[in-house]
Interface confidence: low
């Protein structure tokens, strides 16, 4: 079950819940946003204060890391399995250092299996964080510091830090280095969403959340 099912079962308070995949006993703890946009959102990524190191290995990005109440990555394997069971939407919520907020909403999101390097698939962008997708389309394979699957002769994950669906290297990286205010500009390896804030701007906060399309 995901946060949408948790919501439908009567739990309508934000917080950390234990989720499971259908036909599986494997459990994962995730933060559920039960208030935003009707609730039922499973948070798959959050950056807010730089307290967690996101320059992690392939295995760590596969199983997840961090603290579901704070900064964390839910895990590519869980998200891949979840998003291949039914159709999901992805909402990416962004905050800059000047108090502005924006979002990008994709009407269809899923990750391929590990054998296909958790390639990201996205369709139907709307929202306020840019008319053009800051996650390159068509989607790319996931890369980490120890798994170079990008399209660059460089190693994007080592150069820009963090695991992400790098292109060469592409217009986004929400898992980049966390830079505090007044140190957040001219940072090529920061938390980037190009079509909202441009090239060198590193964001204050990000949240990636998913929910079944038929919620």
């Amino acid at each position: 079950r995901d946060c949408a099912e948790v919501f439908k079962s009567g739990h309508t308070t934000n917080g950390v819940y234990t989720l499971t995949l259908p036909n599986s006993t494997e459990e994962v703890k995730a933060y559920c946003d039960m208030e935003a946009g009707g609730g039922g959102w499973t948070i798959i990524q959050r950056r807010e204060d730089g307290s967690v190191d996101f320059q992690r290995t392939w295995k760590e990005y596969k199983v997840g890391f961090g603290n579901p109440s704070g900064e964390y990555w839910l895990g590519n394997e869980f998200v891949s399995q979840l998003t291949n069971q039914q159709r999901y939407v992805l909402k990416i919520h962004l905050k800059d250092w000047e108090g502005n907020e924006a979002y990008s909403l994709y009407e269809h999101f899923y990750l391929s299996s590990e054998e296909l390097n958790y390639r990201i698939h996205l369709k139907g962008l709307t929202g306020t964080a840019g008319k053009i997708s800051s996650i390159s389309q068509p989607g790319n394979d996931f890369s980490t510091k120890d798994a170079d699957n990008d399209k660059c002769i460089c190693k994007c994950s080592q150069m820009l830090t963090g695991g992400w669906w790098f292109d060469a290297c592409g217009p986004s990286n929400l898992n980049g280095m966390y830079y505090p205010q007044r140190q957040n500009t001219n940072k090529f390896n920061g938390i980037k969403w190009y079509y909202w804030k441009g090239s060198g701007y590193s964001l204050k906060g990000t949240t990636m959340m998913i929910r079944p399309a038929d919620f």
Epitope: I132, S136, Q137, K151, C169, T185, Y194, G198, G200
Partner: antibody, heavy 121, light 106 residues
Framework: EVQLVESGGDLVQPGGSLRLSCTAS????????MTWVRQAPGRGLEWVAN????????YFLDSVKGRFTISRDNAKDLLFLQMNSLRGEDTAVYYC??????????????WGQGTLVTVSS | DIQMTQSPSTLSASVGDRVTVTCRAS??????LAWYQQKPGKAPKLLIS???SLESGVPSRFSGSGSGTEFTLTISSLQPDDFATYYC????????FGQGTMVEIK
């Protein structure tokens, strides 16, 4: 030596179509974003459209969206701009330009000599 | 969209003069700014990128400065070959040029 050579400019009537080509040499064409920039007679420079290395992302100036298409042939080191429903305000010298950026946007480091498109009845 | 405003539009100067062209962005572009030189009938030439990085082969009399929304191109001692039109361009978010500054002989 990097070279960009445009061709295809002509006199065309309003509502007509034209296809511009750009032949690139002296660099690995498939590794760079490519751009079209135009300059109306006696006026300034205006970015028109650009295309990612593999051709999978294309961006356009609002006023040409739906009328212009950009494409490339990496096997032949060619860049194209297909211009339909041409208007008088599209009259300009069109430059083929290389974008140096390793991200989405960079400065334009090499320019062709330009090809003149005149839209007039 | 980000607008770029250059001033002055025309600048009359003599050989040896120190010349300054300014460029203002409608919102912050950090330092993602380029300067180009264009001579009549020719394509523009990239002089400076990232606000202050001089391109290879460009004479050291050219320099760029600024960040955020205010930028400056300076020619320390104007030479006969420098009479041309100069454009700033932001590449922080899409690509937009200033309207140009013509440097002419006084």
């Amino acid at each position: 030596e990097v070279q960009l050579v445009e061709s295809g400019g002509d006199l065309v009537q309003p509502g007509g179509s034209l296809r511009l080509s750009c032949t690139a040499s002296g660099f690995t064409f498939s590794k760079y974003w490519m751009t079209w920039v135009r300059q109306a007679p006696g006026r300034g420079l205006e970015w028109v459209a650009n295309i990612k290395e593999d051709g999978n992302e294309k961006y356009f100036l609002d006023s040409v969206k739906g009328r212009f298409t950009i494409s490339r042939d990496n096997a032949k080191d060619l860049l194209f701009l297909q211009m339909n429903s041409l208007r008088g305000e599209d009259t300009a010298v069109y430059y083929c330009v290389r974008d140096r950026g390793i991200e989405v946007a960079g400065p334009f480091d090499y320019w062709g000599q330009g090809t003149l498109v005149t839209v007039s009845s | 969209d980000i607008q770029m405003t250059q001033s002055p539009s025309t600048l009359s100067a003599s050989v040896g003069d120190r010349v300054t062209v300014t460029c203002r962005a409608s919102q912050t572009i950090i330092n993602w700014l380029a300067w180009y030189q264009q001579k009549p009938g020719k394509a523009p030439k990239l002089l400076i990128s990232k606000a202050s990085s001089l391109e290879s082969g460009v004479p050291s009399r050219f320099s760029g400065s600024g960040s955020g929304t205010e930028f400056t191109l300076t020619i320390s001692s104007l030479q006969p070959d420098d009479f041309a039109t100069y454009y700033c361009q932001q590449y922080n978010r899409y690509w937009t040029f200033g309207q140009g500054t013509m440097v002419e002989i006084k």
